[in-house]
Amino acid sequence: SSPTSSASSFSSSAPFLASAVSAQPPLPDQCPALCECSEAARTVKCVNRNLTEVPTDLPAYVRNLFLTGNQLAVLPAGAFARRPPLAELAALNLSGSRLDEVRAGAFEHLPSLRQLDLSHNPLADLSPFAFSGSNASVSAPSPLVELILNHIVPPEDERQNRSFEGMVVAALLAGRALQGLRRLELASNHFLYLPRDVLAQLPSLRHLDLSNNSLVSLTYVSFRNLTHLESLHLEDNALKVLHNGTLAELQGLPHIRVFLDNNPWVCDCHMADMVTWLKETEVVQGKDRLTCAYPEKMRNRVLLELNSADLDCDPILPPSLQTS
């Protein structure tokens, strides 16, 4: 017998699936070809099957959907819209599926979606309305609680002529839909900076992972509003020093643990306040592992072991006294 589908039309908001319906009565609990299903675990796994589209005949009971290791390329509007809707779908993993384009409304009609993992996809074209589903200034709140976007930066030759950081942040902030987001992972994305408004508009964050990026400074980033923040991962960036404003904000967060390993700390006179703070604070995990990278004479010195006499700056000579 031929396969059947339980998908159908949400005409205006999900044009892609308007035609995904079978001629036969739907069998909502059947398992799609090339997938493994466990009704008891409410789980469907369609993993490493070179799928080019999201299966149309997903069982209505699915709570956890793994579509990893495929070749999806593009997620159109309403890619998961079905009739009846996938009302139970809570965790969706699309990592490593060669997605380079996620369109507005791609995750619409998933009322219970709490965890979304798009990691390891070269997202050259992430719509600002990928998560909000609408271009309204204030959208309906997204149910998302965890958004995992590790290593979504495309190769340099595939990036568009715009800021990758800006594209991602636009999607995070559109319509203020992600006000309930508690975990955001943005590791390994070559971020050079963090746009200053992003954290202020994600007030529910408990966990923020910015590790393995290229962040040089946090000077313009405010953590003040993140009163629920419990973990902040900044390992493996290009941070040289944390300044007083940042230190005070971090110290003021009641539950915070900060991870700062493997940054190229510059141990000169500008580092004095940070060293003092490190010696007193309990918020930095593994603070005894932090070492200087520059200047050369300070390389590998442990920050906690430095004193003010170690932290000098070479005097800046007036131009007339500088030698070439």
Epitope: E53, A73, D100
Partner: antibody
Framework: EVQLVESGGGLVQPGGSLRLSCAAS????????MHWVRQAPGKGLEWVAY????????YYADTVKGRFTISRDNAKNSLYLQMNSLRDEDTAVYYC?????????????WGQGTTVTVSS | DIVMTQTPLSLSVTPGQPASISCRAS??????????LHWYLQKPGQPPQLLIY???NLESGVPDRFSGSGSGTDFTLKISRVEAEDVGVYYC?????????FGQGTKLEIK
């Protein structure tokens, strides 16, 4: 050489049924999505239905939804279109066509077509 | 549904002369990653054949006198020097979303 050969067309009365087949050769059939496209006499091309390579995704034009069913048998390198409740306006040449994916794909190989005539 | 509108609906060209066919989509069929617009030629008594995919990519085996351009909603198919074997009906088609739709066709004749 890529070859697609349709069969199963013919004359059928309104309300009747017909099953079209498409035999594929010269390529790894199970790696490709497949479409049916039709062309009414003297008219342009109309997309009818799509099935993904592993039969995980199915899409239909509104004009045939609920009446036509697309299916495939990768072991037999064959594509099918079951057509029920046929109408006069279903009269057309039906082509099967190959694609590498639905949205990022295109119709890169076509069969010669099989003619379906719905008439009383 | 996305409506594809081709102009002109027919044209008659002297061999060796250029020809141009326009295709307009009722909404954008381009993203920054891909252009979802393709061109086909249906010669008399034959099935269609792919000429150009993703707006500007020449299908293997298609003569390089054919070229495609455009993005967003406006696309063009050009034949630099028309030959007798180019006669037939030319169709544009989008693959932005379901349903996939074709233009109404442009009939090319030789003068």
């Amino acid at each position: 050489e890529v070859q697609l050969v349709e069969s199963g067309g013919g004359l059928v009365q309104p309300g009747g049924s017909l099953r079209l087949s498409c035999a594929a050769s010269g390529f790894t059939f199970s790696n490709f999505g497949m479409h049916w496209v039709r062309q009414a006499p003297g008219k342009g091309l109309e997309w009818v239905a799509y099935i993904s390579s592993g039969s995980t995704s199915f899409y239909y034009a509104d004009t045939v939804k609920g009446r036509f069913t697309i299916s495939r048998d990768n072991a037999k390198n064959s594509l099918y279109l079951q057509m029920n409740s046929l109408r006069d306006e279903d009269t057309a040449v039906y082509y099967c066509s190959r694609t590498n994916s639905l949205l990022r794909g295109f119709f890169d190989a076509w069969g010669q077509g099989t003619t379906v005539t719905v008439s009383s | 549904d996305i409506v594809m509108t081709q102009t002109p609906l027919s044209l008659s060209v002297t061999p060796g002369q250029p020809a141009s066919i326009s295709c307009r989509a009722s909404q954008s069929v381009s993203s920054s990653s891909y252009t979802y617009l393709h061109w086909y030629l249906q010669k008399p008594g034959q099935p269609p054949q792919l000429l150009i995919y993703s707006a500007s990519n020449l299908e293997s085996g298609v003569p390089d006198r054919f070229s495609g351009s455009g993005s967003g909603t406006d696309f063009t198919l050009k034949i630099s020097r028309v030959e007798a074997e180019d006669v037939g009906v030319y169709y544009c088609q989008h693959s932005w979303e379901i349903p996939l739709t074709f233009g109404q066709g442009t009939k090319l004749e030789i003068k």
